[in-house]
Interface confidence: low
């Protein structure tokens, strides 16, 4: 999906009002310095691409983020503010429903959500220009 035409300010508002708090809740009990940020993004469409990938694509050691509160709110924000996004996600969501068995919060998931926090923060504040 090409995130270029999303309403970035509306997505940012959704992040600030709820998604950020849900991410913090998920990470509660974890030190903010426990994980190093290894994933980054250069602009807002790129950030959303990385956010979508980390949130909804199962990875080795962490297959259970898609049903978390922050993930559902992320999906809702993208569906509302990114034209045509919903249609691209129907098949992927159905496949995920069949695969998902139980919710397990692993250290790998915590690390992945830590990466997500960094990506969201970068999305929320595009980089200063290098002078």
């Amino acid at each position: 999906y090409d995130f270029t035409n999303c309403d970035f300010e509306k997505i940012k508002a959704a992040y600030l009002s709820t998604i950020s708090k849900d991410l913090i809740t998920y990470m509660s009990g974890t030190k903010s310095t426990e994980f190093n940020n290894t994933v980054s993004c250069s602009n807002r469409p790129h950030c959303l691409t990385e956010i979508q990938s980390l949130t909804f694509n199962p990875t080795a050691g962490c297959a259970s983020l898609a049903k978390e509160m922050f993930a559902m709110k992320t999906k809702a924000a993208l569906a509302i503010w990114c034209p045509g996004y919903s249609e691209t996600q129907i098949n992927a969501t159905q496949a995920m429903k069949k695969r998902r068995k139980r919710k397990v919060t692993t250290n790998k998931c915590l690390e992945q959500v830590s990466q997500l926090q960094g990506l969201w923060r970068r999305f929320n504040r595009p980089l200063l220009k290098q002078q």
Partner: antibody
Framework: EVQLVQSGAEVKKPGASVKVSCKAS????????MNWVRQAPGQRLEWMGI????????SYNQKFKGRVTLTVDKSASTAYMELSSLRSEDTAVYYC??????????????WGQGTTVTVSS | EIVLTQSPATLSLSPGERATLSCRAS?????MHWYQQKPGQAPRLLIY???NLASGIPARFSGSGSGTDFTLTISRLEPEDFAVYYC????????FGGGTKVEIK
């Protein structure tokens, strides 16, 4: 716990340069911006500039442009502010202040203890 | 550059009284932050984005306003509240107001 620890007081002669350091701990250094703010005796707070530790991008107050240079050492989680061509009016307390952009409106939520720079001949 | 004007410059009140501090911007701003500074100390964030209490700040502090006019209110002054208060706006340049000193009457 977020902490910003600044270098010690400096006494400089007019025309010289000063470099103040700000060592960050308790958070991921590259996740937030670092501001530099100064306060001359009895005066208001004056914003000097801001740097992104993530990529070294900077934005400066036009008043200081050309005289102030902000840099970071990511490996040491340390930000630096260098002010050149010092004059007596630069005598002030210099603060680093983290700007957390999880705050709507981007507030400076943690400050260093301040570094006193005295410019005197 | 957006200029912030704070009034009054000095506010003389007694503990238990209500303090109302004003900050006026030379042009419209989205948000206003408020900081407290005590002698010999660094500023401390009190209110962010006009009306949100920063972490660890007691509920007697509140902020309001929009556009060019913003207010910091301390509902009942405690002895530790006597200090200088600065407003600050975020735009391409950050700027601070001149400060309001809240002193014991």
């Amino acid at each position: 716990e977020v902490q910003l620890v600044q270098s010690g007081a400096e006494v400089k002669k007019p025309g010289a340069s000063v470099k103040v350091s700000c060592k960050a701990s308790g958070y991921t250094f590259t996740d937030d911006y670092m501001n530099w703010v100064r306060q001359a005796p009895g005066q208001r707070l004056e914003w000097m500039g801001i740097i992104s530790p993530y990529n070294g991008g900077t934005s400066y107050n036009q008043k200081f442009k050309g005289r102030v240079t902000l840099t970071v050492d990511k490996s040491a989680s340390t930000a630096y502010m260098e002010l050149s061509s010092l004059r007596s009016e630069d005598t002030a307390v210099y603060y680093c202040a983290r700007e957390d952009y999880d705050y709507d409106g981007y507030a400076m939520d943690h400050w260093g203890q301040g570094t006193t720079v005295t410019v005197s001949s | 550059e957006i200029v912030l004007t704070q009034s009054p410059a000095t506010l003389s009140l007694s503990p238990g009284e209500r303090a109302t501090l004003s900050c006026r911007a030379s042009s419209s701003v989205s948000y206003m932050h408020w900081y407290q500074q005590k002698p010999g100390q660094a500023p401390r964030l009190l209110i962010y984005a006009t009306s949100n209490l920063a972490s660890g700040i007691p509920a007697r502090f509140s902020g309001s306003g929009s556009g060019t006019d913003f207010t910091l209110t301390i509902s009942r002054l405690e002895p530790e509240d006597f200090a200088v208060y600065y407003c600050q706006q975020w735009s391409s340049n950050r700027t601070f107001g001149g400060g309001t000193k809240v002193e014991i009457k």
